[in-house]
């Protein structure tokens, strides 16, 4: 039959070449002389000339050694023709399979592999995977089957077998407990890949295992006891820097300290923060300390980390004895702002009030007083007693100095400490109204017609407060009532002035006396311009000239 079974040829054959492989034979050779040829890649197309055929005998020839890793299979066609060139057979498929020789060593994909694993993990924990390739066949032979192993481990602490490798997958895992970053931060493993499933050629690479930090070390105070001195009343004052050591990885959450005042700060006077670079605890005052109330505070501060501990660890505690230093404190007016009611217009020399300050210091310091700000200059203050007296007329109606009935004065107290300190107080004098102002009409100038005159309505104002104001009463004096009438409206806050007799055009004085509810009387002269006109007028018309 014009068929040939697949031909197996080992790669790297040593010859001699050409090497006879198989004979092509057509049974048509009984009838006629047959000439054989082959075509296909490896024969008449690239890579040309690897195979040839003896034209007359049909022997298939190999001309040179084969390389399975280059071409693992050749597919050729065999042809048989008669002397006249006519085809006597259909083209025949010739498969040439190149069989593998173990002519390649395994190759790791990297010279150095890098992996990491958390410290303190248990055996069984995966670390990393390494890979080696082998160009040889791993399907039909073991030539390309790679087995992985660990050749050596450095350092050999705490055990010489800290890691193992899966012989088939190259996955490295932890086999022994005791990984401790603080003792051994990195392991270097020499790894091997061996073909023939572990019985052939070996190649090596390096696997570097970084041991990652876990928070398995507590921060520890060093020292654990501190003494500090702080002036009283200082807020935001740095009391003490507390130092800790932590064996975990610097600047990681497992290293960064978190401080907590556990005891001794009953009044919430202190606060503690972590310095971002040094990791120190910076103890500062949140509120001013009072030497007179408590001259020593003993604080207990605990330190942990930003990250939680991965195991139960004892926490470190520091003791800080804070000595409060006495400072000369300023006298404090009691109360800081004092409200005193006083009648306006009290006689000069009349006492207004006593306004004194207390000194927080324990020593019996002498306090002297003086007025710091007295805009109207109405008051004086006794430097020893703090007695405030009137030296000017207190005028509630003085709009320049009095706002909403209150006259504001600032006073100062000074102690005799070294250096002396001062404190200020505010004296708010609420001025009680006295009926010292009569009613006043507005406007005080009017223009009116002498024929059918319009009534003039004047508003009445009184600088005093009720009840020293409306209802008002009006009265015309000095014979003004001959030509004029004055009547107060029902509400008692306006006066109506009317011309009751004819007056020639001119300017007249109307004498109007107004009195308030407290009978305080005020005489006002109204300038009345009378015009020759009817009804309403604002200004007198000029003299009329006929044509």
């Amino acid at each position: 039959d014009w068929v040939v079974a697949p031909i197996s040829v080992p790669e790297n054959g040593k010859g001699p070449f050409p090497q006879r492989l198989n004979q092509l034979k057509s049974n048509k050779d009984r009838d006629t002389k047959i000439f054989y040829s082959i075509t296909g890649p490896g024969a008449d197309s690239p890579p040309e000339g690897v195979f040839a055929v003896e034209k007359e005998t049909g022997w298939l020839l190999l001309n040179k050694p084969l390389d399975r890793e280059e071409i693992a299979k050749y597919e050729l066609f065999g042809h048989a023709v008669s002397e006249n060139g006519a085809s006597v057979e259909d083209p025949m498929n010739i498969s040439i399979i190149v069989t593998d020789q173990n002519d390649h060593k395994p190759k790791f994909t990297q010279d150095t592999f890098r992996g990491s694993v958390l410290e303190g993990v248990l055996p069984g924990t995966s670390v990393m995977q390494v890979t080696a390739t082998d160009e040889d066949d791993a399907i039909y032979t073991y030539n390309g089957v790679v087995a992985y192993s660990i050749h050596s481990q450095e350092p050999k602490d705490p055990h010489d077998l800290m890691f193992t490798i899966h012989r088939s997958t190259g996955t490295i895992s932890v086999i022994s407990s005791g990984l401790d970053r603080e003792k051994v931060p990195e392991y270097t493993l020499t790894i091997q890949a061996t073909d023939m499933d572990g019985d052939g050629s070996t190649t090596t690479a390096v696997a570097v295992v970084e041991i990652l930090d876990a928070n398995d070390n507590a921060p520890m105070f060093d020292p654990q006891k501190y003494e500090a001195h702080v002036p009283e009343n200082a807020v935001g004052h740095e009391v003490q820097r507390l130092t800790v050591t932590d064996l975990d990885a610097p600047n990681s959450p497992a290293w960064r300290a978190t401080y907590l005042i556990m005891g001794g700060d009953d009044g919430d006077h202190f606060t503690i923060t972590t310095h971002p670079e040094s990791n120190q605890g910076i103890l500062t005052t949140r509120k001013g300390l009072d030497f007179e109330a408590k001259n020593q505070h003993t604080l207990y501060v605990e330190v942990t980390n930003e990250a939680p501990f991965v195991l139960k660890l004892p926490t470190s505690t520091a003791t800080i004895v804070v000595h409060v230093e006495d400072v000369n404190e300023a006298p404090v007016f009691v109360p800081p702002s004092k409200v005193v009611e006083v009648q306006e217009g009290i006689p000069t020399g009349e006492p207004v009030c006593v306004y004194t300050a207390e000194d927080p210091d324990k020593e019996n310091q002498k306090i002297s007083y003086r007025i710091l700000r007295d805009p109207a200059g109405w008051l004086a203050m006794d430097p020893d007693s703090g007695q405030v007296t009137a030296v000017g007329t207190l005028d509630r109606e003085d709009e320049q100095f009095v706002r909403n009935n209150i006259y504001e004065v600032m006073v100062l107290a000074m102690d005799n400490g070294s250096p002396p300190t001062t404190g200020t107080g505010t004296l708010l004098l609420t001025l009680i109204d006295v009926n010292d102002h009569g009613p006043v009409p507005e406007p005080r100038q009017i223009t009116i017609c002498n024929q059918s005159p319009v009534r003039q309505v004047l508003n009445i104002t009184d600088k005093d407060l009720s009840p020293h104001t409306s209802p008002f009463q009006a009265q015309l004096t000095d014979d003004s009532d001959i030509y004029w009438t004055a009547e107060v409206n029902e509400e008692g806050d306006t006066v109506v002035l009317s011309l009751k007799k004819f007056l020639k055009q001119d300017t007249y004085d109307v004498h109007l006396s107004l009195s308030d509810h407290g009978n305080k009387e005020q005489l006002t002269v109204i300038r009345a311009t009378v015009c020759d006109c009817h009804g309403h007028v604002e200004t007198c018309p000029g003299p009329w000239k006929g044509g």
């Epitope: 248990l122 193992t164 012989r167 876990a214």
Partner: antibody, heavy 117, light 111 residues
Framework: EVQLLESGGGLVQPGGSLRLSCAAS????????MSWVRQAPGKGLEWVSA????????YYADSVKGRFTISRDNSKNTLYLQMNSLRAEDTAVYYC??????????WGQGTMVTVSS | QSALTQPASVSGSPGQSITISCTGT?????????VSWYQQHPGKAPKLILS???KRPSGVSNRFSGSKSGNTASLSISGLQAEDEADYYC???????????FGGGTKLTVL
Amino acid sequence: EVQLLESGGGLVQPGGSLRLSCAASGFTFSSYAMSWVRQAPGKGLEWVSAISGSGGSTYYADSVKGRFTISRDNSKNTLYLQMNSLRAEDTAVYYCADTNSAKFDPWGQGTMVTVSS
Amino acid sequence: QSALTQPASVSGSPGQSITISCTGTSNDVGAYNYVSWYQQHPGKAPKLILSEVNKRPSGVSNRFSGSKSGNTASLSISGLQAEDEADYYCTSYTMGSTFMLFGGGTKLTVL
């Protein structure tokens, strides 16, 4: 001489609790992972739980997960197994064993836990 | 059902040799050279007799030897003695949280 000595076993009712201890001596306790292995009467060995040398990492067999807690106190060279919600099938001799380099060695003498009403 | 398979029992006469097999998978016995063997006499704690397939701890008789082929490890005892009668357990390392697998145990009877 390396020694492990278990204690704390006894009779307990189903649903009850028990705490086993294992005192270690003769080696650097904190450098080694430790395991509890149990053996039911007439049966084979069954791994129960393991803890790393520092105590930061723990493993449990599925059969005890959520009920048993392994812990250690390296300052006292002692391993513990807190057993809660005990069942009849937890009846066994409980051994503690050093677990390093993929072997259990040495073993303690064992302590018997009986769960029965 | 144990992760590693051992014959339930093996027997032999004094002076004879016996072999106990321990079969796992390509992810445990086949993947790592970390098979250990333990001997347990009745009422006693197990005792390590071989580690890393074939390493004997000090004090263990050289009559005990170990080997591994593919996914199966074997314990061989030569020159059987009466005191060898005991239960034998194999363990293998595997990656993961159940990092040590136990065999079901083999009862060795010395006839």
